[in-house]
């Protein structure tokens, strides 16, 4: 044969012509169309690596490669077919037209569709094992996947079952979270109650503290009873003793009368050579009884005998009689010595009286009465003054004539009213008069228009309350 | 017998000045203190100052600034000076001394003028 | 310390018990609440001091009570004399009146 040509006709069909002699030989063959063309980049029967391929175009893929061999195996069914039918009209025409030289021809003919068959067969094989090689991967992608799946499956399992025990754990707590308010409100409520119930206990307390106080001034006043009794008691055992003693030098004139050293006031404690300041045990005129003072050793030649101290407020001097009569507060501190002390005192030799004064200003003044003296209980304990000196102001704020001492429950004042009641205080109180040094104690800032504090009014005037005073008496010939 | 008898009362414009004086007797006026207290017509009492025995004065915030009390102890004598009156400054102006001798502001009052009638008026 | 008596106006015959109540808006100590009795065209009279104490001439009819914030002055028979205006002041470091209570003929 002289030439084969291969062309595509108008509507897509492979045509085979073959040019013999005079005769030509046209096949029509029906196209692949889903199968790839032989210059198409693909090697056959390459092993391809796995591409990381979605699971559902894996799925498209191999549906799509079904249908291709599904195609093929028609398309070789039908040129199967073909062939024969035209084997079969050849050999007819052969045999009819009896032409013996074509036969050759139709052998060549024949030989080349069987090649051709062949080729395409071969060319499915390839395909087939394209498919395969396709599949095998699709199938191993697959499993990948359904591994990878039943892994992730695995995790969102684990993942659900944490998050459930999260949620149990959350509303456990929760719960518990729920208690704890529950329990912190009824501890709340509970907490109120006991305050309320501490502040009951608190101000029944304070009642208490109240009454224990009145006890103890009470006691207080009982005790300095007690201890005068046991002072006159002393006083008689020690004058039974003497007695005794006398008695018995009389008959045995060896025994030695003990001599006892005792001081009446500071003046007695300086001049024995006891110059420093301090709380000193003096003891009363004409007897045994004792009492502790402060004596100024340093101040003015010093021997002073401190009978009164406001100096901070910590003793409270709106005080009984009683009280003032046997003294109160700490001779270290705060305090009045007592009035029989200071009567038999005084009554005893002349005293001179010394009254220091400080007001908030950082300011002092003092007023120096020559002679000083208290009457008997008998008489109030009515003050005696006379020859004012000193920086306190040229009138005396100590009433002239002098006053007797009034206390909250002894008013012997010359006022309608109870002067101690309304300006507090034991004092020597006139009508009410233009001092009262045992007054209400007022802190700074708080010490003016306060009419009922520690005056000295021909210093301060009435309404200035006095930060500190002290009252101190001497003999007049120290 | 205590006595104390106010006077110096009348009429005046506001903005105007007027001086009350208040005789004492029967005490030692050297001894206590002495206070004005006011009473508007139909009206309730009102303190308006107050002295001591050696001077010390004491005024409400009403007051202060524009009313100055003073004392004469030798005449027995308590004065008011009263400036820059007000129309509320109208009243019955008394005197009156302190229950208790020194007592500044801590007393009630035992003994009191008649009154002086104060009238702020244009 | 602001004082507030009550009632404004009694309206009692003679003979009767008049109970007349003065509140103090704080605490206040009974020594220093004294009653004022005035009469039209006259001087207040002091009648009690320090709560519960009768000045010097005054009947025993009159008295005085109460502590803290509450006090009482009680008129325990009602005289002709006695219709007048009460006063109740307190005096502690200050001045101050209440307004004032009148007892009238009912």
């Known amino acids: 044969y002289n030439n084969f040509r291969k062309s595509m006709d108008s509507i897509g069909k492979k045509q085979y012509q073959v040019q013999h002699g005079s005769c030509s030989y046209t096949f029509l063959l029906p196209e692949m169309d889903n199968c790839r063309s032989s210059s198409s980049p693909y090697v056959s029967n390459a092993v391809q690596r796995d591409a990381p391929l979605e699971y559902d175009d894996s799925v498209q893929r191999l549906q799509v490669l079904e249908n291709i061999m599904e195609n093929n195996t028609q398309w070789l069914m039908k040129l199967e077919n073909y062939i024969q039918d035209n084997m079969k009209k050849e050999m007819v025409e052969i045999q009819q037209n009896a032409v013996q030289n074509q036969t050759a021809v139709m052998i060549e003919i024949g030989t080349n569709l069987l090649n051709q068959t062949a080729e395409q067969t071969r060319k499915l094989t390839d395909v087939e094992a394209q498919v395969l090689n396709q599949t095998t991967r699709l199938e191993l992608q697959l499993l990948e996947h359904s591994l990878s799946t039943n892994k992730l499956e695995k995790q969102i399992l684990d993942q659900t079952s944490e998050i459930n025990k999260l949620q149990d754990k959350n509303s456990f707590l929760e719960k518990k979270v729920l208690a704890m308010e529950d329990k912190h409100i009824i501890q709340l409520q509970s907490i109120k109650e006991e305050k309320d119930q501490l502040q009951v206990l608190v101000s029944k307390q304070n009642s208490i503290i109240e009454e224990l106080e009145k006890k103890i001034v009470t006691a207080t006043v009982n005790n300095s009873v007690l201890q005068k009794q046991q002072h006159d008691l002393m006083e008689t055992v020690n004058n039974l003793l003497t007695m005794m003693s006398t008695s018995n030098s009389a008959k045995d004139p060896t025994v030695a009368k003990e001599e006892q050293i005792s001081f009446r006031d500071c003046a007695e404690v300086f001049k024995s050579g006891h110059t420093t300041n301090g709380i000193y045990t003096l003891t009363f005129p004409n007897s045994t009884e004792e009492i502790k003072a402060y004596c100024d050793m340093e101040a003015g030649g010093g021997g002073w005998t401190i009978i009164q101290r406001r100096e901070d407020g910590s003793v409270d001097f709106q005080r009984t009689w009683k009280e003032y009569k046997v003294g109160f507060g700490n001779p270290s501190g705060e305090y009045w010595l007592g009035n029989e002390f200071v009567s038999q005192l005084t009554n005893q030799q002349r005293y001179v009286l010394k009254i220091h004064l400080k007001d908030w200003e950082g300011n002092e003044a003092y007023s120096l009465y020559e002679h000083f003296y208290l009457s008997s209980e008998e008489l109030n304990y009515r003050i005696h003054l006379k020859g004012l000196t000193g920086t306190a102001g040229k009138i005396s704020s100590i009433s002239q004539p002098g006053n007797d001492f009034s206390t909250k429950d002894g008013d012997n004042d010359k006022c309608i009213c109870k002067c101690s009641q309304m300006l507090t205080g034991g004092w020597w109180f006139d009508a009410c008069g233009p001092s009262n040094l045992n007054g209400m104690y007022y802190p700074q800032r708080q010490n003016t228009n306060k009419f009922n504090g520690i005056k000295w009014y021909y210093w301060k005037g009435s309404g200035y309350s006095l930060k500190a005073t002290t009252m101190m008496i001497r003999p007049a010939d120290f | 017998a205590v006595q104390l008898v106010a006077s110096g009362g009348g009429l005046v414009q506001p903005g105007g000045s007027l001086r009350l004086s208040c005789a004492a007797s029967?005490?030692?006026?050297?001894?206590?203190?002495i206070h004005w207290v006011r009473q508007a017509t139909g009206k309730g009492l009102e303190w308006v100052s107050a002295?001591?025995?050696?001077?010390?004065?004491y005024y409400p915030g009403s007051v202060k600034g524009r009313f100055t009390i003073s004392r004469e102890n030798a005449k027995n004598s308590l004065y008011l000076q009263m400036n820059s009156l007000r129309a509320g400054d109208t009243a019955v102006y008394y005197c009156?001394?302190?229950?208790?001798?020194?007592?500044?502001?801590?007393?009630?009052?035992?003994?009191w003028g008649q009154g002086t009638l104060v009238t702020v008026s244009s | 310390i602001v004082l507030t008596q009550s009632p404004g106006t009694l309206s009692l015959s003679p003979g009767e018990r008049a109970t007349l109540s003065c509140r103090a808006s704080?605490?206040?100590?009974?020594?220093?609440l004294a009653w004022y009795q005035q009469k039209p065209g006259q001087a207040p009279r002091l009648l009690i001091y320090?709560?519960?104490s009768r000045a010097t001439g005054i009947p025993d009819r009159f008295s005085g009570s109460g502590s803290g914030t509450d006090f009482t002055l009680t008129i325990s028979r009602l005289e002709p004399e006695d219709f007048a205006v009460y006063y109740c002041?307190?005096?502690?470091?200050?001045?101050?009146f209440g307004q004032g209570t009148k007892v009238e003929i009912k």
């Open positions: 002295i001591g025995p050696a001077g010390d004065t």
């Open positions: 704080q605490s206040v100590s009974s020594t220093y």
């Open positions: 320090g709560a519960s």
């Open positions: 002041q307190h005096y502690d470091n200050s001045q101050t």
């Open positions: 029967g005490f030692t006026f050297s001894s206590y203190d």
């Open positions: 009156a001394r302190g229950l208790i001798t020194f007592g500044g502001l801590i007393a009630p009052f035992d003994y």
